[in-house]
Amino acid sequence: IIDGYKCKEGSHPWQVALLKGNQLHCGGVLVDKYWVLTAAHCKMGQYQVQLGSDKIGDQSAQKIKATKSFRHPGYSTKTHVNDIMLVRLDEPVKMSSKVEAVQLPEHCEPPGTSCTVSGWGTTTSPDVTFPSDLMCSDVKLISSRECKKVYKDLLGKTMLCAGIPDSKTNTCNGDSGGPLVCNDTLQGLVSWGTYPCGQPNDPGVYTQVCKYKRWVMETMKTHR
């Protein structure tokens, strides 16, 4: 997260880290005791999932292996539409005050809505500085019409933009797949943005979760 702040401890109990060995790969969001939602571009053969801690590499955190993941069948590596994936944990999570599932959206929030995005991604770009603490950034949803002025036809119908005018605050390497939460519901998953990260008036681009609720529920049901 560029130009963010340290999240209030324990305020994001649904935030997970997808690790390759001990190295951060992507963020993710707990949606059920067996399931993590993340970005399709975060796919790997297997994952080490850290839950229940704001510190990356925390020895006291829950760590669960995941060997199965289900990409949205319409994900395109060319256009990056449908950048969403479910990761099935090999064993269920132990729920607690530190580990909770996020609330999936009942509706799509409108432009102007205040949201928070979080992650352990680099805080500087293009040179990287990875924080140990979970970082947050407060951003507002931007209309597709406004966002298309920047990204033109790169912006797909189920992509959501968020940012703050004239501000550098944004997501970056390592934040991918992490949550954009608005009014206590998951509205976005970190997908992409311009590079170097943090260029003012280049919004962060997210997968718009409200458009995928049926796919999420059906996929979890099919593979439970």
């Epitope: 571009h41 311009t194 590079y195």
Partner: antibody
């Protein structure tokens, strides 16, 4: 230091295959993609394809589809490009290049290997 | 696919000259254009990304401008080490990536 080091020059017969390696050092391999670009003698740059270091997702230039395979080995931070059914017009210098960006997209090539000359001749 | 057309294909100039190279995209690519320099027998090197941002370590005599379909690379005062071939790439971040045909800058 931050660099991409490629394997040495190859001479191949028409119809054969070649596999070129590209070892990354000095940076974390995972978050980046690797693209392969070739340059025939006296010609311009031709993009061949791209691979995500972690996911193994690929995009190939249409004209090479079916003949080219790009892979990565994250344990050794190495990318590979294999080109099959070689023809004389595949004679070129082959470059690997780091694709800089984050998340699902990359925007430019900010680090290049030194190049590998592949000669196809009977 | 987006086509990139560079002009001129070659030019002769003297040390100290101001040199301008243009690159035209077949459709709008916003400001997502990059410039590379390649010296004989060497790999290309990134000079400018996002149409106008100077890559770290590149001398300030290099500058880029433009958006949409028309872009310019300017060398304000040509130095001996600048004699090379220059390529633009209008990736627009979506494959396939296309490079311009190149502009060779030679000594007059």
């Amino acid at each position: 230091q931050v660099q991409l080091v490629q394997s040495g020059a190859e001479v191949k017969k028409p119809g054969a295959s070649v596999k070129v390696s590209c070892k990354a050092s000095g940076y974390t391999f995972g978050p980046y993609g690797i693209s392969w670009v070739r340059q025939a003698p006296g010609q311009g740059l031709e993009w061949m394809g791209w691979i995500s270091a972690y996911s193994g997702d690929t995009n190939y230039a249409q004209k090479l589809q079916g003949r080219v395979t790009m892979t990565t080995d994250t344990s050794t931070s190495t990318a590979y490009m294999e080109l099959r059914s070689l023809r004389s017009d595949d004679t070129a210098v082959y470059y690997c290049a780091r694709a800089a960006g984050y998340g699902a997209r990359w925007w430019y090539f900010d680090l290049w290997g030194q190049g590998t000359m592949v000669t196809v001749s009977s | 696919d987006i086509q990139m057309t560079q002009s001129p294909s070659s030019l002769s100039a003297s040390v100290g000259d101001r040199v301008t190279i243009t690159c035209r995209a077949s459709q709008s690519i916003s400001s997502y254009l990059n410039w590379y320099q390649q010296k004989p027998g060497k790999a290309p090197k990134l000079l400018i990304y996002g149409a106008s941002s100077l890559q770290s370590g590149v001398p300030s005599r290099f500058s880029g401008s433009g958006s949409g379909t028309d872009f310019t690379l300017t060398i304000s005062s040509l130095q001996p080490e600048d004699f090379a071939t220059y390529y633009c790439d209008g990736s627009y971040s979506t494959p396939p990536i296309t490079f311009g045909g190149g502009t060779k800058v030679e000594i007059k």
